[in-house]
Interface confidence: low
């Protein structure tokens, strides 16, 4: 129903705490360079205004849209042009163009320093002094670095953060309590960020229909006992929620997500037998839990898929009468039978099925033409299965760091023009798939591996879009979302690349590397590895291993030396010479 005041409606629905958190996230995602204090001031002003509208919905400006209210606030910020350049031009536009303009200026790779975690004692002190401000800083810092982070889910992670601090700050050894728990939250939040970015990319590039297809496949896998009408309803609602969040309508998004969670919990009998434990939780935990609930037990009596989609004499008639519905039922029926497939694979199969019907239903004898369609799925299924087997075998042999290095070499050879920091970030993220997925039971590996890789490669595409340098990457990123991963996997050494000349300073290191945390040391070594491959794209694995082992030995020796500086300055040039010789 229509409300006289949209802002009063959302404030009432969400409550003050969530309302303020979501407005802070929205502002931080739009204006990524502003300080916490600047944004906190705006949030307070918006909240005070919302309260006046709650008291009197007819008060001045209470009838304005949220985009108008928020946009006016952002455009009133002093020094907007100096700090944000052409983003300030958005303020010359009217809604809805102004909001679209803000969205287009969101930066997926803002030049902000990494979010460093303070040491335990300092963190606990500031948390105890003012928990609200502390959590506000967390929301602000994450949101500005991840401008498409799923806002209601970020509130969930903030709640987790809060609970961990409350528990650990009361302990004697705060550090050892906090570190593993906060690392766990950080890892989950980063994965959540790339997954959500993928959903927004799908929505932005291919529209709601593409996202809805993704949702139908995913929901059908999770809720195989729900009927098609139920799955369609859930997919439609989920599409609306994601469209709102991707579009910056965070209050509506969070409100609608809460409604969807409520609906699911009120309709468990027709959706899934696995929802009860989620539904017993408070709102943020409930919605999070529902989003990753385990798959329901598959119905025992499902007939073979061929009956309705290959053997039925009416296939072409049914397809012609309502293409989207017929393809939707195919995707639903196939997905509920295959929780062991990735959503990307299921969408490729549905696309293949659609292409087959398009071709065959125009022929003289359609059944003879489409009769082999299920057999034609085989190579599409085998390809990702082989990918999982090969990569998980390699991960088990090399461990995470070694596996990342293998991927780094592979991807630097595929796209040597891409900047080294981007290649290192991508390889480190892609390499984590081993730890994340290869330890899972066999039937969960494929969906985990492929859908995670697709999300990481989406980030590669987004970063590459800003400064396109590789034709290989452009080719893979231009196609459909579900074809990206197979496209990247199929890339080989870029023969058009002219190798980089050898620069000694690229491989020159100093004693400061010795005191870096392990992760930073790894990144330094991986940076050197990518540069080596750019210098010698056709170097063999054996040659690269020799050089990297020598490099590791050099670091180990010099970091243990009494006079580290002298060791680095004398042994460093020798290492560079040996590297050149090994790769000659």
């Amino acid at each position: 129903e229509a409300h006289k005041s949209e802002i009063a409606h959302r404030y009432n629905d969400l409550g003050e705490q969530h309302f303020k958190g979501l407005v802070l996230i929205a502002f931080s995602q739009y204006l990524q360079k502003c300080s916490y204090d600047e944004h906190a001031k705006l949030v307070q002003e918006v909240t005070d205004f919302a309260k006046t509208c709650v008291a009197d919905e007819s008060a001045a400006n209470c009838d304005k849209s949220l985009h108008t209210l928020f946009g006016d606030k952002l455009c009133a910020i002093p020094n907007l042009r100096e700090n944000y350049g052409e983003l300030a031009d958005c303020c010359t536009k009217q809604e809805p163009e102004r909001n679209e303009c803000f969205l287009q200026h969101k930066d997926d790779n803002p030049s902000l320093p990494p979010f460093e975690r303070p040491e335990a004692e300092a963190m606990c002190t500031s948390f105890k002094e003012n928990p609200t401000t502390f959590m506000g800083h967390y929301l602000h810092e994450v949101a500005r670095r991840h401008p498409y982070f799923y806002a209601p889910e970020l509130l969930y992670y903030a709640e987790q953060y809060n609970e961990i601090l409350t528990q650990c700050c009361a302990e004697a050894d705060k550090e050892s309590c906090l570190t593993p728990k906060l690392d766990g939250v950080k890892e989950k939040a980063l994965v959540s960020s790339v997954r959500q970015r993928m959903k927004c990319s799908s929505m932005q590039k291919f529209g709601e229909r593409a996202f809805k297809a993704w949702a139908v496949a995913r929901l059908s896998q999770t809720f195989p006992n729900a009927d098609f009408a139920e799955i369609t309803k859930l997919a439609t609602d989920l599409t609306k929620v994601n469209k709102e969040c991707c579009h910056g309508d965070l209050l509506e998004c969070a409100d609608d997500r809460a409604e969807l969670a409520k609906y699911m919990c009120e309709n468990q009998a027709t959706i899934s037998s696995k929802l009860q434990t989620c539904c017993d939780k408070p709102l943020l935990k409930k919605a999070h839990c529902l989003s990753e609930v385990e798959h329901d037990t598959m119905p025992a009596d499902l007939p073979a898929i061929a009956a309705d989609f290959v053997e039925d004499q009416e296939v072409c008639k049914n397809y012609a009468e309502a293409k989207d519905v017929f393809l939707g039922t195919f995707l639903y029926e196939y997905s509920r039978r295959h929780p062991d497939y990735s959503v990307s694979l299921l969408l490729r199969l549905a696309k293949k099925y659609e292409a087959t019907l398009e071709k065959c239903c125009a022929e003289a004898n359609p059944p003879a033409c489409y009769g082999t369609v299920l057999a034609e799925f085989q190579p599409l299924v085998e390809e990702p299965k082989n990918l999982v087997k090969t990569n998980c075998d390699l991960y088990e042999k090399l461990g995470e760091y070694g596996f990342q290095n293998a991927i780094l070499v592979r991807y630097t050879q595929k796209a040597p023009q891409v900047s080294t920091p981007t290649l290192v970030e991508a390889a480190r993220n892609l390499g984590r798939v081993g730890t994340k997925c290869c330890t899972l039971p066999e039937d969960q590996r494929l969906p985990c591996v492929e859908d995670y890789l697709s999300a990481i490669l989406n980030r590669v595409c987004l970063l590459h879009e800003k400064t396109p340098v590789s034709e290989h990457v452009t080719k893979c990123c231009s196609g459909s979302l579900v074809e990206r991963r197979p496209c990247f996997s199929a890339l080989t050494v870029d023969e058009t690349y002219v190798p980089k000349e050898f620069k000694a300073e690229t491989f020159t290191f100093h004693s400061d590397i010795c005191t870096l945390p392990e992760k930073e040391k790894q990144i330094k070594k991986q940076t050197a590895l990518a540069e080596l491959v750019k210098h010698k794209p056709k170097a063999t694995a054996e040659q690269l291993k020799t050089v990297m082992d020598d490099f590791a030995q050099f670091l180990d020796t010099c970091c243990k030396a009494a006079d580290k500086d002298t060791c680095f300055s004398t042994e460093g040039p020798n290492l560079v010479t040996r590297c050149k010789d090994a790769l000659a």
């Epitope: 006992n225 468990q268 009998a269 027709t270 037998s273 037990t297 009596d301």
Partner: nanobody, 115 residues
Framework: QVQLQESGGGLVQPGGSLRLSCAAS????????MSWVRQAPGKGPEWVSA????????RYAESVKGRFTISRDNAKSTLYLQMNSLKPEDTAVYYC????????GSQGTQVTVSS
């Protein structure tokens, strides 16, 4: 082999009652949500009611709410549908199904409401 066998249908006057049963075998009955679906002559299948695996959560189509009650006995692997205040428009073949599915894997039981 999954088998669902409905019984309890028959001819009843408007306002009367019937209790349908569905005996299940060939699968772990207690692990699955179950539904009743009906099909009137010349019409498509219509979902009537569903119950979750434990029997705690039940759902009904608007047309039968307040008149029909779904229940189950997991020890006996049997699903029930108690139908009160029956109306002529309840006339149909009633099927039990696994999950909330309208695909029918059984013969069904005929319910006719007529004076």
């Amino acid at each position: 082999q999954v088998q669902l066998q409905e019984s309890g249908g028959g001819l009843v006057q408007p306002g009367g009652s019937l209790r349908l049963s569905c005996a299940a075998s060939g699968f772990t009955f207690g692990s699955f949500g179950m539904s009743w679906v009906r099909q009137a002559p010349g019409k498509g299948p219509e979902w009537v009611s569903a119950i979750d695996s434990g029997g705690a959560d039940t759902r009904y189509a608007e047309s039968v709410k307040g008149r029909f009650t779904i229940s189950r006995d997991n020890a006996k692997s049997t699903l029930y549908l108690q139908m009160n205040s029956l109306k002529p428009e309840d006339t149909a073949v009633y099927y039990c199904t696994i999950g909330r599915s309208s695909s029918r894997g059984s013969q069904g039981t005929q319910v006719t409401v007529s004076s």
